[in-house]
């Protein structure tokens, strides 16, 4: 029995439009058919859930309609995109993976991706 290892990039810079993408990859100890992926944000020792989705292997990842996250899955790899980010959202984003079915349950937590968000400078007024 081995613990599940989760890998994610150490640092990602959000785009000027406030979009950040990163890959969350897990080494599955078993043949899971149902997987839950959660993105946690850790800042100032406070942890909040950013978004979560459960998917069946081979199917697409579906977040809630009002979620700021979207994603796709391919094998043991999940491509996550977080939208609507602002400078105040800079922080450590942790990928949590749970193998929900079939038994046994496995938990895997990544070391986190530090996402840096820089608010764009407002466009200067033109004198035309």
């Amino acid at each position: 029995c081995k613990a599940m290892h989760v890998a994610q990039p150490a640092v990602v810079l959000a785009s000027s439009r406030g979009i950040a993408s990163f890959v969350c990859e897990y080494a599955s100890p078993g043949k899971a058919t149902e997987v839950r992926v959660t993105v946690l944000r850790q800042a100032d020792s406070q942890v909040t859930e950013v978004c979560a989705a459960t998917y069946m292997m081979g199917n697409e990842l579906t977040f809630l309609d009002d979620s700021i996250c979207t994603g796709t899955s391919s094998g043991n790899q999940v491509n996550l995109t977080i939208q609507g980010l602002r400078a105040m959202d800079t922080g450590l984003y942790i990928c949590k993976v749970e193998l929900m079915y079939p038994p046994p349950y496995y938990l895997g937590i990544g070391n986190g991706t530090q996402i840096y968000v820089i608010d764009p400078e407002p466009c200067p007024d033109s004198d035309f």
């Epitope: 029995c1 081995k2 613990a3 599940m4 100890p29 149902e34 839950r36 946690l40 942890v47 859930e49 979560a52 459960t54 949590k96 749970e98 929900m100 079915y101 038994p103 046994p104 349950y105 496995y106 938990l107 937590i109």
Partner: antibody
């Protein structure tokens, strides 16, 4: 504040049934897995069962499999444990506990005592 | 099933002393998912340490966790009167979730 409160414990005869409950408040109940953990008098902690998120996935300790059923009502923020075919060795304080963001059991109820005796 | 063994069964110490509690897992790989709990008589357990070494919210810094592979340690740097209790280790990385038998820290 974040809390779990168990209820429904009592004295029951061997072979009979009992349902205990756990009321949650102060957090988004459906976003967490919730466990039952028991402790026999003077003994250590024993994990009993867990139910995840929307209630579809449940896991049990071998000692209660087939006799106990865990369920949840997310609209009522309540967890249940239906205990059938009770045995003397099921006598214990039953705690409900939340699986926190990082997986450890971060919030515990005060416990409810279940005594199986004739 | 991952079996956890704790030692010693009882630790008799005086306030101000250092307490070192051990937890050994039957299989390696659970290091990221090892927790320590404190339980006082008549009370529910309280989470102290998760992920082998991270302190839970509100836990004083005299409590620290360490270890990897199969061997883990909970250290209380200077025992306060309120620290005399039973301590349990637990693995939560895979089902069934298992607890160690506990170590009782009592006053010498």
């Amino acid at each position: 504040q974040v809390q779990l409160v168990e209820s429904g414990g009592g004295v029951v005869q061997p072979g009979r049934s009992l349902r205990i409950s756990c009321a949650a408040s102060g957090f988004t109940f459906s976003s967490y897995g919730i466990h039952w953990v028991r402790q026999a008098p003077g003994k250590g902690l024993q994990w009993v069962a867990v139910i995840w998120y929307d209630g579809r996935n449940k896991y049990y300790a071998d000692s209660v499999k087939g006799r106990f059923t865990i369920s949840r009502d997310n609209s009522k923020n309540t967890l249940y444990l239906q205990m059938n075919s009770l045995r003397a060795e099921d006598t214990a304080v039953y705690y409900c506990s939340r699986s926190g963001s990082f997986g450890a059991f971060d919030i515990w109820g005060q416990g409810t005592m279940v005594t199986v005796s004739s | 099933e991952i079996v956890l063994t704790q030692s010693p069964g009882t630790l008799s110490l005086s306030p101000g002393e250092r307490a070192t509690l051990s937890c050994r897992a039957s299989q390696s790989g659970s290091s990221s998912y090892l927790a320590w709990y404190q339980q006082k008589p008549g009370q529910a357990p309280r989470l102290l340490i998760y992920g082998a070494s991270s302190r839970a919210t509100g836990i004083p810094d005299r409590f620290s966790g360490s270890g990897s592979g199969t061997d883990f340690t909970l250290t209380i740097s200077r025992l306060e009167p309120e620290d005399f209790a039973v301590y349990y280790c637990q693995q939560y990385g895979t089902s069934p979730f298992t607890f160690g038998p506990g170590t009782k820290v009592d006053i010498k």
